[in-house]
């Protein structure tokens, strides 16, 4: 049986930001029409990464395996029926949760990104590193960044490729 | 609400295995008491990540997010109740996907490993790095090695901390 | 001691079929994955096929894809070879090979072979 | 579909002395490659898996090196009982034997 992971263009672009690698970055982008002032944004949260070395790039790969794969990304079934289930979360629509996180990311505040991300049971050091990252992506970041990420994610979001 | 991630302490040993690092993957695998011929076989497997580089655990890393969060990690809810749902898919257990790419990691062919990778849509790119990293392991395990990482995986799959 | 014996070789008009067997002994059949090589007369080995362990995954080469069949029965140690559409190019001696428990390596013990003829 | 070629086709060599036989993948294949002994009228024997692992009971006269697209088995001290043809095998896609090459005994 062939399956259909959810949104791949979304873990594309992640895991180009989080691995450093520019021209990898650009080329996940270019597929979804990002402009320019969307591609600086990317990069600015990338460089976090760079400076941030190795480890956090493993950490918040860590991160983004745990929501990906947990009970919520796995459809509220208890709430649900089975056509709803099928309808809501079996498409190849980007998780609830992880979309949380990334625009908590975004737009919070380190404490209440840090705070979504200890709900998945995190090390002390993946939440340390969840911390370093985000602070520098606010240090980095201006508002305007913050709108040309979000401009991207909705076209990632909402792109045939997820 | 609190959610429980799907058997977190795997993806602590995968993420520390695919890192590099070998302190962090002594730490997870003292947790689930695992012996020395045990922690001997994950460093072989470690010890393929280190020498294919950073775009080697970047790559992995991107299929074990992708098989995490593909459709049938979610349940087949199309065929299950939401009772079943609820039992089945929504606890702490590893999703079988996530095990029989582990398994054929470990037992299959490379053509076999690869032939799974790539019913996740993956990338050119990440279909030969998963070919290179399952040569390496093949290359460096003996019939021993892999029985003591089965052994260690069962350890993990039935780990409280699973 | 680890014994492949193949059988049901002979000589076959170009369009017929051949079923091939290998008997194995002396280890544990179902924890290994199997292989069958040829080798054309005076000619190199050439491998054309191999089958997982639980028999769920099979892979051919090129030149016997779509007319050669590989198989397994667990229960009787056997391996199987059905060869349909026969070549005269397919005149060769037919070994089967088993590889390491989870895949250590390719082809550590062979059978001695059976000899396979097409020709009109 | 990868190719793998031998060199030389036919080696003769004296008692003793050093055998070299080569074998190159048309691509990288890391370190799946595996060498084979194939006496007249027997089946193929397993001298050295992976490049350069030794498989039990192969005498200490047979070595292999190399990685990615090029390897080598060495005879270290050829003996009468060496003649034979040797076969190197990649299992990194599929698998895919190389021609062949002869060793005659001087």
């Known amino acids: 049986v062939k399956m259909a992971e959810t949104c791949p263009i979304f873990y594309d672009v992640f895991f180009a930001v989080a691995n450093g690698n520019e021209l990898l970055l650009d080329l996940s982008l270019t597929k979804v029409n990002a402009t320019e002032p969307e591609r600086t944004a990317m990069k600015k949260i990338q460089d976090c990464y760079v400076e941030n070395g190795l480890i956090s790039r493993v950490l918040d790969g860590l991160v983004m395996t745990t929501i990906s794969s947990s009970k919520d990304c796995m459809g509220e079934a208890v709430q649900n029926t089975v056509e709803d289930l099928k309808l809501n979360t079996l498409g190849r629509e980007i998780c609830p949760a992880v979309k949380r996180g990334v625009d908590l990311f975004l737009t919070g505040t380190p404490d209440e990104y840090v705070e979504q991300v200890a709900q998945y049971k995190a090390l002390p050091v993946v939440l340390e590193n969840a911390r370093i990252l985000k602070n520098c992506v606010d240090a980095k970041m201006t508002e305007e960044d913050k709108e040309n990420a979000l401009s991207l994610l909705d076209k990632i979001y909402t792109s045939p490729l997820c | 609400v609190k959610m429980a991630e799907t058997c977190p302490i795997f993806y602590d040993v995968f993420f520390a295995v695919a890192n590099g690092n070998e302190l962090l993957l002594d730490l997870s695998l003292t947790k689930v008491n695992a012996t020395e011929p045990e922690r001997t076989a994950m460093k072989k497997i470690q010890d393929c990540y280190v020498e294919n580089g950073l775009i080697s655990r970047v790559l992995d890393g991107l299929v074990m997010t992708t098989i995490s969060s593909s459709k049938d990690c979610m349940g087949e809810a199309v065929q299950n109740t939401v009772e079943d749902l609820k039992l089945n898919t929504l606890g702490r257990e590893i999703c079988p996907a996530v095990k029989r790419g582990v398994d054929l990691f470990l037992t299959g062919t490379p053509d076999e490993y690869v032939e799974q990778v790539a019913q996740y849509k993956a990338l050119p790119v990440v279909l030969e790095n998963a070919r290179i990293l399952k040569n390496c392991v093949d290359a460096k395990m003996t019939e021993e090695d892999k029985e003591n990482a089965l052994s260690l995986l069962d350890k993990i799959y039935t780990s409280p901390l699973c | 001691e680890v014994q492949l014996v193949e059988s049901g070789g002979g000589l076959v008009k170009p369009g017929g079929s051949l079923r091939l067997s290998c008997a194995a002994s002396?280890?544990?059949?179902?924890?290994?994955?199997m292989n069958w090589i040829r080798q054309a007369p005076g000619k190199g080995l050439e491998w054309i096929s191999y089958i997982s362990s639980s028999d769920d995954t099979t892979y051919y080469a090129d030149s016997v894809k779509g007319r050669f069949t590989i198989s397994r029965d667990n229960a009787k140690n056997s391996l199987y070879l059905q060869m349909n559409s026969l070549r005269a190019e397919d005149t060769a001696v037919y070994y089967c090979a088993r590889d390491g428990k989870y895949n250590t390596v390719a082809g550590d013990h062979w059978g001695q072979g059976t000899l396979v003829t097409v020709s009109s | 579909e990868i190719v793998m070629t031998q060199s030389p086709d036919f080696q003769s060599v004296a008692p003793k002395e050093k055998v070299t036989i080569t074998c190159r993948a048309s691509q990288n294949i890391g370190s799946s490659l595996h060498w084979y002994q194939q006496k007249p009228d027997q089946s193929p024997k397993l001298l050295i898996k992976?490049?350069?692992q030794s498989f039990s009971g192969v005498p200490s006269r047979f070595s292999g090196s190399g990685s990615g697209t090029d390897f080598t088995l060495t005879i270290n001290s050829l003996e009468a009982e060496d003649a034979a043809t040797y076969y190197c095998?990649?299992?990194?896609?599929?698998?895919?034997f190389g021609q062949g090459t002869k060793v005659e005994i001087k």
């Open positions: 002396g280890f544990t059949f179902s924890d290994y994955y």
């Open positions: 992976y490049a350069s």
């Open positions: 095998l990649q299992s990194y896609t599929l698998r895919t």
